[in-house]
């Protein structure tokens, strides 16, 4: 029959070539001479000429060694024609299967594989997977079936079989306990991939297993006892640096120290922080220490890590004896800011108050006083007693020196220590108002028409405080009432000035006397410009000849 069973050809044939494979034969050759040809990739299309057929004999030839890893199967078509070129058979499929030879070694996908595993893990823990490929066939033969093995381990501590590899998956696992990063931080495994499922060609690669740090070492104080000296009152002062050693991986959470003051700091005077590089504990004062209250503190500091311990570990404790050193402390005014009410305008030499300071030091030191800042120069202070007296006129209405009725003075106390120290206090004098200012109209110049004049409304101001202000009373003096009237409004804070008789265009003085609720009287002369006009005016119209 015009059929050819699949032809198997081993790859890498040694020849000689051309090499016979099979004979194509049509049973029509009894009737006529048959010519044979083949088509398809490997015959008349790329890769051309690998196969050929003898036209008259039908012998199928192979012209070169085959490579299964390049082309594993050729699908050709055989043709049979008569002498006149007419097809005598349907094209016949010719399958040429290239059978595998073990001509490829396994190849690892990397020269060096890198993996990691936590120290102290239990046997059976997976570390990493390595992969090797083999181009040979692994379905019908074992040529491409790779088996993995570990050839060697460096170092061989604690022994030479710390890891195992799954022969078919390439998964490397821990097989023994005892992985200790602090002893062996890294293992180098020489791994093998062998084809023929372990009986063939071998290739090697390296698997580097990094042993990751676990917090299995506690930080330890070295030394465990410290003595420090700190001047009293110093805040943020570095008291002592505490040093620890930790065998875990530097700069990791398992190495970085966390310090805790366990005892001896009842007043919450101290704080401890970790230096980011040296890992030392930096003990500093959070508040100033008081030599007079307590001249020695014994602190107990415990150290742990940022990361929790992976097993129960004893914690290290340090003892720090802090000696507080006495310093000459400044006198302190009591209170630091003193408010005193005093009437403005009191006579010179009148006492204002006594303002004294206390010295925190134990020995009885002499304190002397002086005024440090007295903007208006109104006060004096007795250096021994702290008595403050008036030496100038206290004026509540002095806007340059008084704000919101308060006059602020800074005083100084100095002890007789060596060297002497000073303290300051603030004296806030609340000035009590007296009726020392009369009412004043605003504005003091007016312009008015002499025909149908508009009433002039003047505001009344008084620098004093209530009750020394409104209601105000108005009175015209010096015959000003012949031509003018002055009336205070109902609210009592404005005065209305009206022209009641015709005056020719000119400038006139209107004598206006205003008195406040406390009958403090103030005479003011209003300059009135009268214009020849009707109703409202701001400046006189026309040529002005007035003076």
């Amino acid at each position: 029959d015009w059929v050819v069973a699949p032809i198997s050809v081993p790859e890498n044939g040694k020849g000689p070539f051309p090499q016979r494979l099979n004979q194509l034969k049509s049973n029509k050759d009894r009737d006529t001479k048959i010519f044979y040809s083949i088509t398809g990739p490997g015959a008349d299309s790329p890769p051309e000429g690998v196969f050929a057929v003898e036209k008259e004999t039908g012998w199928l030839l192979l012209n070169k060694p085959l490579d299964r890893e390049e082309i594993a199967k050729y699908e050709l078509y055989g043709h049979a024609v008569s002498e006149n070129g007419a097809s005598v058979e349907e094209p016949m499929n010719i399958s040429i299967i290239v059978t595998d030879q073990n001509d490829n070694k396994p190849k690892f996908t990397q020269d060096t594989f890198r993996g990691s595993v936590l120290e102290g893990v239990l046997p059976g823990t997976s570390v990493m997977q390595v992969t090797a490929t083999d181009e040979d066939d692994a379905i019908y033969t074992y040529n491409g079936v790779v088996a993995y093995s570990i050839h060697s381990q460096e170092p061989k501590d604690p022994h030479d079989l710390m890891f195992t590899i799954h022969r078919s998956t390439g998964t490397i696992s821990v097989i023994s306990s005892g992985l200790d990063r602090e002893k062996v931080p890294e293992y180098t495994l020489t791994i093998q991939a062998t084809d023929m499922d372990g009986d063939g060609s071998t290739t090697t690669a390296v698997a580097v297993v990094e042993i990751l740090d676990a917090n299995d070492n506690a930080p330890m104080f070295d030394p465990q006892k410290y003595e420090a000296h700190v001047p009293e009152n110093a805040v943020g002062h570095e008291v002592q640096r505490l040093t620890v050693t930790d065998l875990d991986a530097p700069n990791s959470p398992a190495w970085r120290a966390t310090y805790l003051i366990m005892g001896g700091d009842d007043g919450d005077h101290f704080t401890i922080t970790t230096h980011p590089e040296s890992n030392q504990g930096i003990l500093t004062t959070r508040k100033g220490l008081d030599f007079e209250a307590k001249n020695q503190h014994t602190l107990y500091v415990e150290v742990t890590n940022e990361a929790p311990f992976v097993l129960k570990l004893p914690t290290s404790t340090a003892t720090i004896v802090v000696h507080v050193e006495d310093v000459n402390e400044a006198p302190v005014f009591v209170p630091p800011s003193k408010v005193v009410e005093v009437q403005e305008g009191i006579p010179t030499g009148e006492p204002v108050c006594v303002y004294t300071a206390e010295d925190p030091d134990k020995e009885n030191q002499k304190i002397s006083y002086r005024i440090l800042r007295d903007p208006a120069g109104w006060l004096a202070m007795d250096p021994d007693s702290g008595q403050v007296t008036a030496v100038g006129t206290l004026d509540r209405e002095d806007e340059q020196f008084v704000r919101n009725n308060i006059y602020e003075v800074m005083v100084l106390a100095m002890d007789n220590g060596s060297p002497p120290t000073t303290g300051t206090g603030t004296l806030l004098l609340t000035l009590i108002d007296v009726n020392d200012h009369g009412p004043v109209p605003e504005p003091r110049q007016i312009t008015i028409c002499n025909q149908s004049p508009v009433r002039q409304v003047l505001n009344i101001t008084d620098k004093d405080l209530s009750p020394h202000t409104s209601p105000f009373q108005a009175q015209l003096t010096d015959d000003s009432d012949i031509y003018w009237t002055a009336e205070v409004n109902e609210e009592g804070d404005t005065v209305v000035l009206s022209l009641k008789k015709f005056l020719k265009q000119d400038t006139y003085d209107v004598h206006l006397s205003l008195s406040d609720h406390g009958n403090k009287e103030q005479l003011t002369v209003i300059r009135a410009t009268v214009c020849d006009c009707h109703g409202h005016v701001e400046t006189c119209p026309g040529p002005w000849k007035g003076g």
Epitope: K14, G15, P16, F17, P18, R20, Q23, F35, S37, E48, G49, V50, A52, V53, E54, K55, E56, T57, W59, L60, L61, N63, K64
Partner: antibody, heavy 118, light 107 residues
Amino acid sequence: VQLVEESGGGLVKPGGSLKLSCAASGFTFSSYAMSWVRQTPDKRLEWVATISSGGHYTYYPDSVKGRFTISRDNAKNTLYLQMSSLKSEDTAMYYCASYYYGIPFGYWGQGTTVTVSS
Amino acid sequence: ELVMTQSPSSLSASLGEGVSLTCRASQDIGINLIWLRQEPDGTIKRLIYDTSSLDSGVPKRFSGSRSGSDYSLTISSLESEDFVHYYCLQYGSSPLTFGAGTKLEIK
């Protein structure tokens, strides 16, 4: 009837070159592998070169590799052997022969003589 | 390189006599062996291929056989045109190699 006829033989000095030809007729030249075989003066036969039917692949023994080149022109039904760097031991009768039934050497020519001598 | 040892190098026989020529292969070549004859004028013709298959037009008195690595050409009854040179060629291993030849002479 399959016929092959060689030509191009002659006397050549050592180190010289020569090109042999083989004209084929009576069969479909382009579908048969072709070879050159030589017979030395002591009557020993030695395979020299083979070329596949399409001319894509060539084969040589070590003794001539790099010096001899077999080629073919299927349009002209002609086989060639380019010989260079000739040595005295290349002196022989050179035959062209066809594969037949997929094996050597079904049909032979009459041969052409090559003499390498100074 | 595979060596073909052909024996005898020459053989004298009478007309009508039967003779056998032998080639021994130094390595396995399977059935991949042909027998050739060379006329006195230098003409070469293939007689047998694949150890025992007769080429078309070759008389039936010629036959080929194999015993292990020994390959034989047998002429059952010699005729006058048979007294020529005979060669074996193996094509089972590269390179192709010939036997040294046997000269068959008339006694």
